[in-house]
């Protein structure tokens, strides 16, 4: 379910000097960069896939998660570079014998195209272009996620407008 | 300025060792997947040996497997390769390259030093 | 391990000619692909990386083209600083990574 955002009106006859709580506002953190409901922070260093999902959890978030087709479009057109990888939250669990995002869930056979083995040891990164397998070890860039957070901002209503 | 600059190349006699090491500068050296290429006198272009940025996976070619070892340290901004059991074969130009960007293990070498010889014969 | 085939191996050409180096890999290697440019005494310089993407500084006259087993780097117009030796190298994610053998591009 999408997280609504509430609605601001501001009275004209009100002072407008006055400091007022606006409401609900959705935010990303600084350096963040927004993508419909999530925020997106794509690491400058490198680590292997097991660092990376602990580094995102040191920043309340997690490594990102992809639903469709149409978020992994829109997350690849932030991609810059076509020689640049980032691990995601999907790795192989050999268990099961299947492709496993870190929320415990499956991908679907009809979600992302993966190249490359589904064996154990096995992660999967994105580049600007399609999605891999590779070797959990490798050491290469990530991409944490959050949902977006209902901030509450005392703001002056001037800056409403 | 980023650079990359080999040394410790040299004439050796087969079954010798030799230390070559590669000072990188002008750049966040502990991102990068490191490289050593070689090139024989009048040949191609051959990849000897690759390290990841902690330095914890590591991959050679297999004509220098168990006779080569590279290292670095991300503290000084180097790379090194020992070369032990030295052979006529692996007389060439030696080459300390960058990997583009830090890209996992797709190495395109976007930076490359200018390379020291070794020579080995008796 | 993964063989890179290159030709023609010299090519002689003429200032402003249009010229077109081919690498045909051994097996599939999607776009995992890079070109370089070498002059005598001098290091390799990458040109072309992901098989397509020019290399930051390098001139729009370079283009690289191709996917799976069979590349292409043409250069439009030939200019003087161009005679070199053209090297195509394959970077799948199991080393070894090898290069093809090389092109002479040499003045006619």
């Known amino acids: 379910q999408k997280p609504s955002i509430g609605k601001c009106s501001v009275d004209i006859q009100q002072n407008r000097t006055k400091t007022t709580e606006r409401p609900d506002l959705l935010n990303c953190p600084i350096y963040w960069q927004q993508v419909q409901e999530k925020c997106l922070l794509f690491s400058h260093t490198v680590n292997p896939w097991n660092n990376s999902l602990a580094d995102c959890s040191t920043k309340e978030s997690s490594l990102l998660l992809i639903q469709d087709k149409d978020e992994l479009t829109r997350t690849q057109n932030l991609i810059h570079d076509k020689a640049i990888s980032f691990w995601i939250g999907l790795n192989f669990s050999l268990s099961e014998k299947n492709w496993k995002w870190i929320n415990g869930s499956f991908l679907s056979s009809n979600d992302l195209k993966i190249t490359g083995d589904a064996k154990e040891n096995s992660c999967v990164y994105i580049s600007q272009t399609s999605v891999y397998s590779e070797y959990c070890s490798t050491e290469m860039k990530w991409i944490c996620q959050k949902e977006l957070t209902l901030v509450r901002n005392k703001v002056s209503p001037d800056s409403w407008l | 300025q980023v650079q990359l600059v080999e040394s410790g190349g040299g004439l050796v006699k087969p079954g010798g060792s030799l230390r070559l090491s590669c000072a990188a500068s002008g750049f966040t050296f502990s991102q990068y997947y490191m490289s050593w290429i070689r090139q024989a006198p009048g040949k191609g272009l051959e990849w000897v040996s690759y390290?990841?940025?902690?330095?914890?996976?590591?991959y050679y070619a297999d004509s220098v497997k168990g006779r080569f070892t590279i290292s670095r340290d991300n503290a000084k901004n180097s790379l090194y390769l020992q070369m032990n059991s030295l052979r006529a074969e692996d007389t060439a130009v030696y080459y300390c390259a960058r990997s583009l960007m830090a890209t996992g293990t797709h190495l395109y070498f976007d930076l490359w030093g200018r390379g020291t010889l070794v020579t080995v014969s008796s | 391990d993964i063989q890179l085939t290159q030709s023609p191996s010299s090519v002689s050409a003429s200032v402003g000619d249009r010229v077109t180096i081919t690498c045909r890999a051994s097996?599939?290697?999607?776009?995992?692909l890079a070109w370089y440019q070498q002059k005598p005494g001098k290091a390799p310089k990458l040109l072309i990386y992901a098989a397509s993407a020019l290399q930051s500084g390098v001139p729009s006259r370079f283009s690289g083209s191709g996917s799976g087993t069979d590349f292409t780097l043409t250069i439009s117009s030939l200019q003087p600083e161009d005679f070199a030796t053209y090297y195509c190298q394959q970077v799948t994610s199991a080393p070894p990574y090898t290069f093809g053998g090389g092109t002479k591009v040499e003045i006619k």
């Open positions: 390290i990841s940025p902690s330095g914890a996976t590591i």
């Open positions: 097996q599939g290697i999607s776009s995992w």
